[in-house]
């Protein structure tokens, strides 16, 4: 908290610019009038202000606002934006997705933090429903809200969604849900060459058929064990002992430490002896 | 910071039920969606059931006629009815929030023969 002290001559900010990043803590308290900053917050970006700096425009802007800023001064927020607890944001009525898009872009690239998560309800709230540019926009920004989404809303996402999935942001998708995501994907990687397109498609494969894993396994991808066991037991069964050797390579070694669970457990026990024993592991069907 | 807490487990007989809760601090559940799992000791996770931010279902296999999923906004909780539970349903249930790495410590739910 910093002491209410007078502004020292000459001192009174006229607007917010560079000068300001010489002035101590006191002196911004003292010195910068909060309506003028809440005109002017569009140029507090601009300007490399210190942390503790920031805390005092912040304090301002509360002591101006004490009931929740004004959409007009929450749009310019920028970086203050991350100086924001949820309990602040809860304070917020945002309705435009332009103060959405510009507040989710501070924050890009970072895990969804509790003031994300608290402003898109906020947003959600301000809306009363969340249409599918919001959609859109929250996928774009972070992908993994697509498992958030029910398999009848994911049908309306546009393949540039898709592009920007990590493989753990899928990790919470259901089966249902990547049954929906995974033709989007295999439609928006079909130009990559082969390599990079299991890297990309990888994530989604809990989706996929029995005939898209027998034309992978064709094209020595080396799938790892824990994406073997995201697949859809329905689209391994099919699967014959050669086509799984393909599709696993070096890494059907693994399939001893998995016979025990689904879905390895299953197919295990629709081979032939006979063919389980080509792989030298000791499956039991 | 955002917190997740299940609560309801316990030990239960063959047959009986058990309603998990999953209550939310740090962040509203209702833009989101919530699942459930549960992991036995020396298996993998296994997703059990999950409602969608608009309040849809879905169910694994073995969950779906015997297990409920449902949500309260107000109270940001989300439950797990549990029906007719089997030994083999016996392991740490947990919620999280989906499409984030927020998810709770889990509650122990063991069904005894």
């Known amino acids: 908290e910093v002491e209410k002290t007078a502004c020292p001559s000459g001192k009174k900010a006229r607007e917010i610019d560079e000068s300001l990043i010489f002035y101590k803590k006191w002196e911004l308290e003292a010195c910068v009038d909060a309506a003028l900053l809440a005109t002017q917050m569009d140029r507090v970006n601009a300007i490399p202000f210190t942390y503790e700096q920031l805390d005092v425009l912040k304090h301002k802007l509360d002591e101006l606002y004490p009931q929740g800023y004004p959409e007009s001064v929450i749009q310019h927020l920028g970086y203050l934006f991350l100086k924001m607890s949820p309990e602040d944001i809860r304070k917020w009525n945002v309705t435009s997705l332009e103060t959405l898009k510009a507040l989710l872009e501070v924050n890009k690239g970072h895990e969804m933090s509790p003031q994300v998560a608290t402003l898109i309800d906020r947003f959600v709230k301000g809306r009363g429903q969340l249409d599918k540019d919001t959609l859109d926009t929250l996928t774009a920004f972070y992908p993994g809200y697509l498992c958030s989404l029910s398999p009848e809303e994911l049908s309306s996402v546009p393949p540039s969604s898709i592009w920007a999935v990590r493989p753990q942001d899928l990790d919470t998708c259901d089966p249902r849900q990547l049954d929906v995501l995974y033709p989007k994907a295999r439609l928006a990687f079909q130009n990559m060459n082969g390599s990079e397109y299991f890297v990309k498609i990888q994530s989604f494969l809990g989706g996929a058929p029995t005939e898209d894993l027998k034309a992978l396994s064709q094209q020595n991808v080396s799938m790892d064990l824990a994406t073997f066991m995201k697949l859809r037991t329905d689209a391994v069964l099919p699967l014959t002992v050669a086509e799984v050797q393909k599709l696993l390579g070096p890494h059907v070694e693994g399939l001893k430490a998995e016979e025990r669970h689904r879905p390895v457990r299953d197919w295990i026990l629709r081979q032939r002896q006979d063919d389980l024993d080509t792989l030298g592991l000791g499956l039991q069907g | 910071d955002v917190q997740l807490q299940e609560s309801g487990g316990g030990l239960v007989q063959a047959g009986g039920s058990l309603r998990l809760s999953c209550v939310g601090a740090?962040?509203?559940?209702?833009?989101?969606?919530i699942g459930w799992w549960r992991q036995a000791q020396g298996n993998q996770r296994e997703w059990v059931a999950s409602i969608y931010r608009s309040g849809s279902t879905n169910y694994e296999d073995f969950a779906k006629d015997r297990f409920t999923i449902s949500r309260d906004n107000t109270k940001n909780t989300a439950y797990l009815q549990m029906n007719s539970l089997k030994p083999e349903d016996t392991a740490v249930y947990y919620c999280?929030?989906?499409?984030?790495?927020?998810r709770g410590q889990g509650t122990q739910v063991t069904v005894s023969s």
């Open positions: 740090g962040v509203s559940f209702s833009p989101y969606g």
């Open positions: 999280q929030i989906l499409g984030t790495s927020y």
